[in-house]
């Protein structure tokens, strides 16, 4: 008899954020006994698409040649072998960059911090938002959310961060996004560097995984402290 | 916690046979495709076979192909290597591995000896 | 059959270095590559599969680039744990062949 078939591993790449106009190529992994390979997009007609296995069998390719509005959303697949469909994978979620103009980025009071102290990056938009989110380059946990209440629509948001660590140092980017929808994003800032010196209590170098990765056991999440500014905006982890 | 055991190994003589298991537990062992890996002392790794979930496929590299038989039992949750007309260079260290794309588990391996 | 070639195979590097060791194919295998680390008397584990996807448990120091025939494992910063041999693998077609390895040694 049997067991339930295994949930299949879905992936994109070059990544899972990708700028508008390029192209993406999402993978769906399952076993030698696949015959078919079926991809289901949220809130659009099932099955988005099928496919038959590449050789040998275990995996199938989902080919978007052009990045658009359309594609960006929650994907999940599933595979048919001799006794049935699997479990659908785990979702990935394919988000488009370049959807709004490029928020400006700055650090307060200043990009170089010295280790135990504060500091607040500010992310700013041309047209107001209700989503902001900060991504560290390299970080296991990339993005930090600030969203709006209410649907008020905000120009800026602050991340503070307190008391700063060596983990902090690196080079950030930020966007903005409106809550209609979480997979259409700005293009993204130009880049900041945070500098941190000093730090003789966190010897620990800054974590080094890509975004869109698993987190390995050494990772450390960017945890900025402190309230938030602009009664309405709520900080999410996503 | 998936665990993968590997038995059966021991010294051979040349053309002699061999039945090596494998014990799976901690997955659900019928939905998943098998491979056996060997490993001269000193050498590189080289794959030996592979079995389909419910077993209906296997493949062999032709440096074993009619002279390995890979199987499973999906009820008692075991992997199999028949080897028959062994040679010296078959001694090695023996792998059994959860196929998952890669390999994603492997045993700790067991030891075949083929010498006069 | 499809040769993989690493390269270097061997390697003598320092805690803190980065490091980078290149597989090559014989011919294209799209993102079918994975990468293993082994340690002497040990089974070998698996460290970045298809090309560059990365795997729970594994430190983060570790990745994987590449498409095509060529591909790359990449150590950001050595640890004293991470002196191993390294294997890439193919799984594009039958036969399923292993690179010959790359010692990594300490300098």
């Known amino acids: 008899q049997a067991g339930p078939l295994p949930k299949p591993t879905l992936w994109a790449e070059p990544g899972s954020v990708i700028s508008w106009g390029n192209s993406v190529t999402i993978w769906c992994q399952g076993t030698l006994e696949a015959r078919e390979y079926r991809l289901d997009k949220e809130e659009s007609p099932a099955p988005w698409d099928r496919q038959n296995p590449l050789e040998p069998k275990n995996k199938a390719r989902f080919s978007i040649p052009s990045m658009t509005e359309d594609y960006a959303g929650r994907y999940r697949c599933y595979y048919r072998s001799p006794v049935g469909w699997s479990q659908p994978s785990d979702p990935l979620e394919l988000v488009m960059t370049g959807a709004y103009s490029k928020p400006t980025l700055s650090a307060l009071p200043s990009p170089l911090v010295t280790s135990g102290k504060s500091v607040t990056l500010l992310c700013q938009s041309r047209s107001p938002m209700d989503t902001f989110l900060l991504i560290k380059e390299r970080a296991a946990h990339p993005l930090l959310h600030l969203r709006s209440e209410h649907g008020a629509q905000q120009h800026q948001a602050e991340f503070p961060m307190s008391p700063v660590t060596s983990v902090h140092g690196g080079t950030y980017r930020c966007f903005s996004s409106h809550g209609f929808s979480h997979y259409l994003l700005s293009h993204p800032s130009d880049p900041l560097e945070l500098i941190v010196s000093g730090s003789l209590e966190d010897p620990r170098p800054s974590p080094t995984r890509s975004v869109s990765t698993a987190a390995g056991p050494e990772d450390q999440p960017l945890m900025p402290t402190g309230s938030v500014p602009h009664s309405g905006l709520r900080r999410h982890w996503e | 916690e998936v665990q993968l055991v590997e038995s059966g190994g021991g010294l051979v003589k040349p053309g002699g046979s061999l039945r090596l298991s494998c014990a799976a537990s901690?997955?659900?062992?019928?939905?998943?495709?098998m491979s056996w890996v060997r490993q001269a002392p000193g050498k590189g790794l080289e794959w030996v076979s592979t079995?389909?979930?419910?077993?209906?496929?296997?493949y062999y590299p032709d440096s074993v192909k009619g002279r390995f038989t890979i199987s499973r039992d999906n009820a008692k949750n075991s992997l199999y290597l028949q080897m028959n007309s062994l040679r010296a260079e078959d001694t090695a260290v023996y792998y059994c591995a959860r196929l998952w794309g890669a390999m994603d588990y492997w045993g700790q391996g067991t030891l075949v000896t083929v010498s006069s | 059959d499809i040769q993989m070639t690493q390269s270097p195979s061997s390697l003598s590097a320092s805690v803190g270095d980065r490091v980078t060791i290149t597989c090559r194919a014989s011919?294209?295998?799209?993102?079918?590559l994975h990468w293993y680390q082994q340690k002497p008397g040990k089974a070998p584990k698996r460290l970045i599969y298809y090309a560059s996807q990365s795997i729970s448990g594994v430190p983060s120091r570790f990745s994987g680039s590449g498409s095509g025939t060529e591909f790359t494992l990449t150590i950001s910063s050595l640890q004293p744990e991470d002196f191993a041999t390294y294997y890439c693998q193919q799984s594009n077609s039958w036969p399923f062949t292993f690179g010959q390895g790359t010692k990594l040694e300490i300098k």
């Open positions: 011919q294209g295998l799209t993102n079918d």
């Open positions: 901690g997955f659900a062992f019928s939905s998943y495709d």
């Open positions: 079995i389909s979930s419910s077993g209906s496929y296997t």
